[in-house]
């Protein structure tokens, strides 16, 4: 799935926030060296998901999945020749 | 590398108005229940988070986008 390929750490953090799992969020944020104030801020966002219940989390997860798999992200507008792919892998 | 559309959605979630955020979501998923949920979450975040909190959340996002794991 394209989501996992593009920026796995983003989706780790997003789904940890949306799931309401504080331990998982802490683990994900450790991977990017988040400071204590940064962790506090992310936990405030997480609180909103927890307070609004399971359906809210599922619906927002649906939004993120829809955007991530939209043509804006999937490459309908993107060059995809072999030459370009070679260039793109060199760029990183 | 994060998709620009995802980056924008998250940025608006933190820095946009509720109307802006909901309209952005509507471009991808125009179901009333989804949009109502987006507004509820956005309003909650705006109520809970100070400007400093939002700056810190944006800082985390910046760390995510520039991480080797992204």
């Amino acid at each position: 799935v394209k989501m996992a390929e593009t920026c796995p750490i983003f989706y780790d953090v997003f789904f940890a926030v949306a799931n309401g799992n504080e331990l998982l969020l802490d683990l994900s944020l450790t991977k990017v060296n988040a400071t204590e104030p940064e962790r506090t801020a992310m936990k405030k966002i997480q609180d909103c998901y927890v307070e609004n219940g399971l359906i809210s989390r599922v619906l927002d997860g649906l939004v993120m999945t829809t955007i991530s798999s939209s043509k804006d992200c999937m490459g309908e507008a993107v060059q995809n020749t072999v030459e370009d792919l070679k260039l793109n892998t060199l760029g990183r | 590398e994060i998709c620009p559309a995802v980056k924008r959605d998250v940025d608006l979630f933190l820095t946009g108005t509720p109307d802006e955020y909901v309209e952005q979501v509507a471009q991808y998923k125009a179901l009333p229940v989804v949009l109502e949920n987006a507004r509820i979450l956005k309003n909650c975040v705006d109520a809970k988070m100070t400007e400093e909190d939002k700056e810190n959340a944006l800082s985390v996002l910046d760390k995510i986008y520039t991480s080797p794991l992204c």
Epitope: A77, L87 | C3, P4, E20, Q27
Partner: antibody, heavy 120, light 107 residues
Framework: EVQLVESGGGLVRPGGSLRLSCAAS????????MNWVRQAPGKGLEWVSS????????YIADSVKGRFTLSRDNAKNSLYLQMHSLRPEDTAVYFC?????????????WGRGTLVTVSS | DIQMTQSPSTLSASVGDRVTITCRAS??????LAWYQQKPGKAPKLLIH???SLESGVPSRFSGSGSGTEFTLTISGLQPDDFATYYC?????????FGQGTKVEVK
């Protein structure tokens, strides 16, 4: 100081090819998506193409899709536009522009442009 | 594609005048709109982004407003240096589009 310097423009026959380059300096190149915008003589601005920081997302205008290829070399702080099957309507000043946001955005810095003339 | 329509195409004004340029989008662009100034033979210069945010270094006589489909650029007291062509640009989609331009000329 942010600087964008385009090169590679010139006179080319219809059906011909040309490669434009944009040398960037004064900022962290990998932090920004980059674009080409063109302006035909006496006309308005037309967006041509955009490339994200690490080339994962490359967007091309329908008017040039299949003929123009966009790439960047982050090690050289350079942006490239390879143009094939050129038409008279591609005649324009081509500007290299830096995006001010993420990968679809406004353009906060522009180069001076390079003129491409397609004529027989 | 989202079409951007500017009005008027040409505007005759004098130094000190209050000038307003309108930009309409064929569909909502939320607040993803920028304004540029361009002088002959030069590259465009960013004035305003996100409909109303003034770019750093741009004089405060320039202001932007609007959201959705209708936007305006206002120059509160026209200066000699402001005679130029102005363009709006939407960036709500990954393929941005520009208005056709408004030329502000000396009356």
């Amino acid at each position: 100081e942010v600087q964008l310097v385009e090169s590679g423009g010139g006179l080319v026959r219809p059906g011909g090819s040309l490669r434009l380059s944009c040398a960037a300096s004064g900022f962290t190149f990998t932090s920004y998506a980059m674009n080409w915008v063109r302006q035909a003589p006496g006309k308005g601005l037309e967006w041509v193409s955009s490339i994200s920081s690490y080339s994962s997302y490359i967007y091309i205008a329908d008017s040039v899709k299949g003929r123009f290829t966009l790439s960047r070399d982050n090690a050289k702080n350079s942006l490239y536009l390879q143009m094939h099957s050129l038409r008279p309507e591609d005649t324009a000043v081509y500007f290299c522009a830096r995006e001010g946001y993420s990968a679809y955005s406004y353009f906060d810095f522009w180069g001076r442009g390079t003129l491409v003339t397609v004529s027989s | 594609d989202i079409q951007m329509t500017q009005s008027p195409s040409t505007l005759s004004a004098s130094v000190g005048d209050r000038v307003t340029i309108t930009c309409r989008a064929s569909q909502s662009v939320i607040s993803w709109l920028a304004w540029y100034q361009q002088k002959p033979g030069k590259a465009p210069k960013l004035l305003i982004h996100r409909a109303s945010s003034l770019e750093s270094g741009v004089p405060s006589r320039f202001s932007g407003s609007g959201s959705g489909t209708e936007f305006t650029l206002t120059i509160s007291g026209l200066q000699p240096d402001d005679f130029a062509t102005y363009y709006c640009q939407q960036y709500n989609t990954y393929f941005p589009t520009f208005g056709q331009g408004t030329k502000v000329e000396v009356k």
